[in-house]
Interface confidence: low
């Protein structure tokens, strides 16, 4: 059958940019910095402004090897700090909560489903 | 072997666009990112701005954000820079350039092309 | 953006000599992340494009000569060329290649008397 867009609107092409790319501050050379910044960054806003974390959940910082885990320690975070709950500041409500995955302290929804939620209505 | 050749020499009159092209071949055209350079008679170096032909993303030198245009043709491997409005001060010899064996393997500009002179003048 | 600043502009010498040049950096060039500094030299010989030397900082391009050494950290750079030849007769930029814009040196003129 004939590829439609939606095929290529799947979790797992923006599970694998997110895992290569997101906060990979040790590229070999900075062309590819200038898009992890930009992945980083829009990672950051979407899950910040949705309330989600990662692609599927906070598993994915878990289950996957990313450049999250190589730049971060498993015990210092599990999943980016943008997956906790925040206070109206844009600060963690509480951070030590939130990496322990105490619930109410961080998103457990994925943003896959937030964001396709959408597009699957076009 | 990874080849850039460039296009020819140009002669154009101030404030008529110019359009330079490098053709790359010798490896896969959308696994690393394309660079121009500037050099201003008996002058240093200037880096423009780079592409990614995978998507066309491009990474400018605010210094010619108004100035360059950077785009791709995927399908005849050929990355072009057109400069907008030329005046004297673009009288230069610009190179295109990219990094090493494989897109991810070294820092530096190993394959350059040979450069394409462009002359304004009324 | 970072400014590179080389030193000395030109310098004139004798076959077989030892010399060296200058590159240092408004910020630092070192990524904590891999302990790599993204620094790189070209050489320009007259009438040619530029041939990449030495890439972070101090690794040498393949097929270049071992009389040609990068070294230095964050913001301090030198080019080494152990015994000047006739043949390396060029201008010698170093780049910063950490951050966009890659800015280039003004580069080092080496003459041979």
């Known amino acids: 059958t004939a590829a439609t867009q939606q095929d290529f609107f799947t979790p797992n092409l923006f599970l694998k940019q997110m895992l290569e790319r997101y906060q990979n501050n040790s590229p070999p050379n900075n062309d590819d910095q200038w898009k992890n910044n930009g992945v980083t960054k829009t990672w950051d806003r979407l899950m910040l402004q949705d309330n989600c974390c990662g692609v599927n959940g906070p598993s994915d910082w878990q289950k996957y090897t990313s450049a999250f885990r190589t730049e971060n320690n498993d015990a210092d975070y599990p999943w980016p700090r943008q997956c906790c709950v925040m206070n109206n500041l844009k600060e963690p409500l509480n951070l030590e909560a939130c990496k322990l995955g105490v619930p109410g302290f961080y998103h457990n929804q994925g943003c896959y489903e937030l964001i396709s939620g959408p597009m699957n209505r076009h | 072997q990874v080849q850039l050749q460039q296009s020819g020499p140009q002669l154009v009159r101030p404030g008529a666009s110019v359009k330079i092209s490098c053709k790359a071949s010798?490896?896969?055209?959308?696994?690393?990112?394309m660079h121009w350079m500037k050099q201003r008679p008996g002058q240093g170096l200037e880096w423009i701005g780079m592409?990614?032909?995978?998507?066309?993303?491009?990474g400018l030198n605010q210094i010619f954000r108004d100035k360059a245009t950077l785009t791709v043709d995927k399908y005849s491997s050929t990355a072009y820079m057109q400069l907008s409005s030329p005046t004297s001060e673009d009288s230069a010899v610009y190179y295109c350039?990219?990094?090493?064996?494989?897109?991810?393997?070294?820092?530096?500009?190993?394959?350059w092309g040979q450069g394409t002179l462009v002359t304004v003048s009324a | 953006d970072i400014v590179m600043t080389q030193s000395p502009s030109s310098l004139t010498v004798t076959a077989g000599e030892k010399v060296t040049m200058s590159c240092k950096s408004s910020?630092?060039?070192?990524?904590?992340?891999?302990?790599?500094?993204?620094l790189t030299w070209y050489q320009q010989k007259p009438g040619q494009t530029p041939k990449l030397l030495i890439y972070?900082?101090?690794t040498r391009e393949s097929g270049v000569p071992d009389r040609f050494t990068g070294s230095g950290s964050g913001t301090d750079f030198t080019l080494t060329i152990s015994s000047v030849q006739a043949e390396d007769l060029a201008v010698y930029y170093c780049?910063?290649?950490?951050?966009?814009?890659?800015?280039f040196g003004g580069g080092t003129k080496l003459e041979i008397k």
């Open positions: 780049q910063n290649d950490y951050s966009n814009p890659f800015t």
């Open positions: 350039a990219r990094r090493g064996r494989f897109s991810y393997d070294y820092g530096g500009f190993a394959y």
């Open positions: 910020q630092s060039l070192l990524n904590s992340g891999n302990q790599k500094n993204y």
């Open positions: 972070w900082a101090s």
């Open positions: 592409i990614d032909p995978s998507d066309s993303e491009t």
């Open positions: 010798g490896y896969s055209f959308t696994t690393s990112w």
